[in-house]
């Protein structure tokens, strides 16, 4: 017996004292376990287990299915085993046809033998097909045939266990190998929309798509900075052998403002993890925010074009947009379009195209937009810059010379006296009175300026120039004087355009 220390428990003895034993089919299996602390016999083969509390295990008529490992255990938990082969020429293999292999791992084709003395125990392809060239295996009569390092290419491979018996090849039932792919990359995750904007009470539903090589990929929706379990629904598909897709749909049937936040779809496999987020913003009611793309005070030269451009955020979608000038609505000359074609876009652009503006077309141009919840407006003050125009130039009864000019910006009127017939009027004359007229109205049209000088100051023949100018241009009017005796006579005045 094996050497043991005195008093130290030893494993039980099994008779007959062999590690492996062959019994013919139909014969009796008789095994004796000798141990003062005998507890039980256990029989195991494939997934079957039996127990026996008698110290002598007896099977009166052995069958092939009695092939297996018989273990005797004593009260100290020590055990000894014998493996019994029940030789049955009609049933050379015991089979468990379920055959799953994990990629890159070994897997066992479970076809243990009932006769260990047969030869050439191996694997063969079904219907005479050869096995893959790189398929390596190790036969073990008690367990089956171990396929080494399973490849993805072996998926759905049809196999038989095979032995030679009396010179003939005998095949087991067929096995179909199902390969569970190894994860060699993180899952691919995507989300139906990156952001959601909802009003209180509306349903929030977002779908995460998880793609991987097999269904054992783990996925979940999580709320950032929260451990609360979210309600999800799943749909899944196998697109071919190693192309699995799952859709995890997260739904909040009636969203509240405090549901706003970042939601993460997280997936992981044995290789690693991946995630994608979507942002939910829940507002108590809709909104419109308008952003002018140009200054709301616009200066434009007479005859030129200008585009009034706004961007605006509208949620829900805008329903009515209009541009208004002087209580009139534009039916054309404007366009309104979404800033992007993105499904979650809430930003829009509206452009009013004003062409060849006249001086009379300055004023307030208003953009109005509304949705089902709110209205909003923005006004542009448009000033049309015009060259001064001299409206009147007269000698008044009180002896004053008066010049009235209109333009925008407000013109400045200067007076010059030219003695004799000189063309250049350089000597400036200070006005007696300067007034800006019609300043009580909105300052969008032309501004009218009136300037007067006292003609009594002129003692000689000559020309008086009234020059009106602003940033856009200048215009002059002339008064010609001739003295007849003591009388001063105004000759018809005339204007001279100076660009």
């Amino acid at each position: 017996q094996p050497s043991v220390s005195p008093g130290e428990p030893s494993p039980p003895s099994i008779h007959p004292g062999k590690s492996d034993l062959i019994v013919r089919v139909g014969d009796e299996i008789r095994l004796l376990c000798t141990d003062p602390g005998f507890v039980k016999w256990t029989f195991e083969i494939l997934d079957e287990t039996n127990e026996n509390k008698q110290n002598e295990w007896i099977t009166e008529k052995a069958e092939a299915t009695n092939t297996g490992k018989y273990t005797c255990t004593n009260k100290h938990g020590l055990s000894n085993s014998i493996y019994v082969f029940v030789r049955d020429p009609a049933k050379l293999f015991l089979v468990d046809r379920s055959l799953y292999g994990k990629e890159d791992n070994d897997t066992l084709v479970r076809c243990p033998l009932t006769d260990p003395e047969v030869t050439n125990y191996s694997l063969k392809g079904c219907q005479g097909k050869p096995l893959p060239k790189d398929l390596r295996f190790i036969p073990d009569p008690k367990a089956g045939i171990m396929i080494k390092s399973v490849k993805r290419a072996y998926h759905r491979l049809c196999l038989h266990c095979s032995v030679d018996q009396e010179g003939k090849s005998v095949l087991s039932e067929k096995f179909i190998l199902k390969v569970r792919p190894a994860f060699k990359a993180v899952p691919v995750v995507s989300v139906s929309k990156a952001s959601y904007l909802l009003r209180e009470g509306e349903e929030f539903t977002v779908t995460c798509t998880i793609k991987d090589v097999s269904s054992s990929v783990y996925s979940t929706w999580k709320r950032e900075n929260s451990q609360t379990k979210l309600q999800e629904k799943y749909n899944s598909w196998h697109h071919g052998d190693f192309n699995y897709e799952r859709q995890a749909t997260l739904t909040i049937s009636s969203a509240r403002v405090n549901d706003s936040g970042v939601f993460m779809c997280y997936a992981n496999n044995t290789f690693g993890s991946a995630n994608v987020t979507t942002t939910l913003e829940v507002v108590d009611k809709g909104f419109i925010n308008i952003f002018p793309m140009i200054n709301t005070t616009v200066f434009v030269n007479d005859g030129e074009n200008v585009d009034l451009i706004v961007e605006y955020e509208a949620f829900p979608k805008p329903e009515h947009q209009q541009w208004i000038y002087m209580n009139r609505t534009f039916t054309d000359k404007w366009e309104d379009y979404p800033k992007s074609e993105n499904e979650s876009n809430i930003r829009y652009v509206s452009e009013l195209h004003l062409t060849r503006l006249k001086g009379t077309e300055g004023g307030t141009y208003t953009f109005l937009v509304s949705n089902s919840d709110v209205n909003a407006a923005i006004a542009f003050n448009v000033y049309v810059n015009t060259k001064p125009e001299i409206l009147t130039y007269d000698r008044l009864v009180n002896g004053m010379l008066q010049c009235v000019a209109a333009g925008f910006p407000e013109p400045t009127i200067d007076w010059y006296f030219c003695p004799g017939t000189e063309q250049r009027c350089s000597a400036s004359v200070l006005p007696v009175d300067v007034q800006t007229l019609n300043s009580s109205g909105p300052p969008f049209g032309k501004l009218v300026v009136q300037s007067s000088i006292d003609s009594s100051a002129f003692k000689h023949n000559g020309t008086v120039e009234c020059k009106a100018y602003n940033d856009v241009g200048k215009t002059s009017a002339y008064f010609n004087f001739a003295f007849k005796g003591n009388n001063k006579e105004q000759i018809h005045p005339h204007t001279l355009f100076t660009p």
């Epitope: 007959p16 062999k18 062959i22 019994v23 013919r24 008789r30």
Partner: antibody, heavy 121, light 107 residues
Amino acid sequence: EVQLVESGGGLVQPGGSLRLSCAASGFTFSDADMDWVRQAPGKGLEWVGRTRNKAGSYTTEYAASVKGRFTISRDDSKNSLYLQMNSLKTEDTAVYYCAREPKYWIDFDLWGRGTLVTVSS
Amino acid sequence: DIQMTQSPSSLSASVGDRVTITCRASQSISSYLNWYQQKPGKAPKLLIYAASSLQSGVPSRFSGSGSGTDFTLTISSLQPEDFATYYCQQSYIAPYTFGGGTKVEIK
């Protein structure tokens, strides 16, 4: 050639010791369970004892008549089986055979020619 | 220990005769029984194992039967080379005891 050859027999006085050897060849000795069987002159066969292989944890078993006096051992690296006989008695006089058990049954499918041990004063 | 009782202890027979030797175990040994042939000055030779399985190279005139406690070795047609002593042996529980032997002699 598959064979077993015993050696080490001879004349020994009662109370003496002797070591028998069995040299194996032609098969994988380390896989085999091995036995000693003896036959007294003009008598029948008597099983002496056995040693299991490595798979059987080299367990040894003995006949009651020799237990405590005889020890069976093996050296797989030398393909050799041994029988150490101590406290020899006259009734231990016999031809001692080394025998091989097949892998899957306890019988003796290969025997040596035997070596004679004579215990006499 | 299990006792093995063989009978007869000797028999005389002629070439061509059918010879039967019996062996009885003191308790059930299932099919754990072997038969050996020994000729004078030679080592024993295995004939039958597991009660009825013929050892490779042994002529088919030798056969074994029985299970439990009673076993039989039969030589269907005795040949000159078959004159020898025959032993049964149980291999169920150590010590692996032999029967006393049956000597088959020429009549």
